[in-house]
């Protein structure tokens, strides 16, 4: 059996010119709703019936998942990071096999001293988090280690991290050139072999809000775009108001279709509206006016 749900209707005209009569509450709400039987078929676009309502997949919403949302949540990470794999040669410590054992007194003391030295070297780099020794080997002591950098996510995070990695390179080059053994003496916390300093690899967090936005928009990827507000990215369709890319439908409603955003123009008791942006109003002749 079918139940008829009464709704007030507003006449809408698409910008192509055809007039359609739709409910004023939600243009996708069906006037008749199946009360019994298989509910699965009423959830469109991959949505599923949970026993009470349709659970819609992004970017859809509505009773039958037929509407396309105006904005999609994208969540950039709070912080972004970079990891630099570096090698330096420490000449002021004799290598022993005990240094390979991370639980030995030798390793713990070396790690403590090396960390203190690097904290001094990299002080003044706001993105600097710390160092992590990954391997120690003979020659005097070849120290393979990671320098960890972190910063708050902003649209310019890559530039900030790239700049920080450059400063790390400059500072490690400077200290390993200056703090060297002279006449078998090292007056610093640690001394280095200048030629043993190498940057092996740099890994930077990859986060692209545009890519996330496009992925989540699925078949509407060409019509969703990223705009920033207070350094935060928003994934929006032109139907979302308040952004540079927002479509102004004037006397109408913006609706997403697979061909992009279009305006559905309103027809009131006194006027009908047309045009791509529903900005062309035509007054109805008086004898068509119904009280």
């Amino acid at each position: 059996p079918l139940a008829t749900i009464p709704v007030s209707t507003t006449s809408l005209t698409s910008s192509e010119g055809s007039t359609i009569s739709t409910p004023s509450v939600d243009i996708s709400t069906p006037v008749t709703t199946s009360i019994v039987g298989d509910q699965c078929s009423r959830c469109k676009n991959g949505g599923f019936w949970d026993g009470l309502k349709c659970q819609c997949l992004t970017p859809y919403y509505g009773e039958s998942c037929e509407e396309v949302v105006n904005s999609i949540d994208i969540a950039p990470p709070e912080t972004v990071s970079a990891q630099m794999e570096l090698t330096v040669t420490v000449t002021s410590v004799k290598f022993t096999d005990e240094l390979k054992n991370h639980s030995s007194q030798e390793f713990r003391e070396f790690n403590k001293t090396f960390t203190e030295q690097m904290n001094i070297v990299y002080s003044g780099i706001p993105e600097y988090v710390g160092v992590n020794i990954t391997n120690l080997r003979l020659g005097s002591v070849v120290v393979e280690h990671d320098v960890l950098l972190r910063t708050k996510y902003t649209p310019e995070y890559k530039t900030a991290l790239d700049n920080a990695t450059e400063v790390v390179k400059q500072k490690i080059t400077k200290v390993t050139t200056e703090q060297i053994m002279t006449n078998d003496n090292c007056s610093a916390l640690m001394c280095f072999n200048t030629t043993g300093t190498q940057v092996q690899n740099i890994t930077v967090t990859q986060y692209d809000p545009v890519e996330e936005c496009r992925q989540k928009a699925e078949e509407y990827e060409d019509y969703f775009l990223v705009e920033y507000r207070d350094q935060k990215p928003y994934c929006i369709s032109p139907c979302e108001s308040g952004f540079n890319a927002s479509k102004n439908c004037n006397h109408g409603k913006c609706q997403m279709s697979q061909n992009g955003a279009r305006c559905l123009c309103v027809t009131t008791e006194t006027h009908w509206y047309s045009g791509e942006d529903c900005n062309q109003g035509t007054q109805k002749s008086h004898h068509h006016h119904h009280h």
Epitope: S92, V93, E109, S187
Partner: nanobody, 124 residues
Framework: EVQLVESGGGLVQPGRSLRLSCAAS???????MGWFRQAPGKEREGVAG???????IYADSVKGRFTISKDNAKNSLYLQMNSLRAEDTALYSC???????????????????RGQGTMVTVSS
């Protein structure tokens, strides 16, 4: 973590002697060791140092009067101070490097372990 505890300080008359000891909680065989002092209102200065292979070095102001030595079996460092002067009055502390430290044959080396110190007052 190596704990260093100094002892032997006190009040002594000019020209007399004192022997300071520094007991370490761990192995000092493969460490550079040193004695530092800080007089009231002055900066800390290196007094004497001994490298991991037993080579010693002294500040000019104490050369010929002070002798640094270490007993690896007892994990102890010593400073024999003779012909003491009023200007030797200071808080004396010992320091130790990390294990296997080389190239610390000078007094400016930054040691990573330090004791609390023992006070030496030279006065008549």
């Amino acid at each position: 973590e190596v704990q260093l505890v100094e002892s032997g300080g006190g009040l002594v008359q000019p020209g007399r002697s004192l022997r300071l000891s520094c007991a370490a909680s761990g192995d000092i065989t493969r460490r550079c060791m040193g004695w530092f002092r800080q007089a009231p209102g002055k900066e800390r200065e290196g007094v004497a140092g001994i490298s991991e292979d037993g080579i010693t070095i002294y500040a000019d102001s104490v050369k010929g009067r002070f002798t640094i030595s270490k007993d690896n079996a007892k994990n102890s460092l010593y400073l024999q101070m003779n012909s003491l002067r009023a200007e030797d009055t200071a808080l004396y502390s010992c320091a130790a490097s990390i294990l296997n430290r080389v190239g610390c044959r000078q007094l400016s080396y930054e040691y990573i372990y330090r004791g609390q110190g023992t006070m030496v007052t030279v006065s008549s």
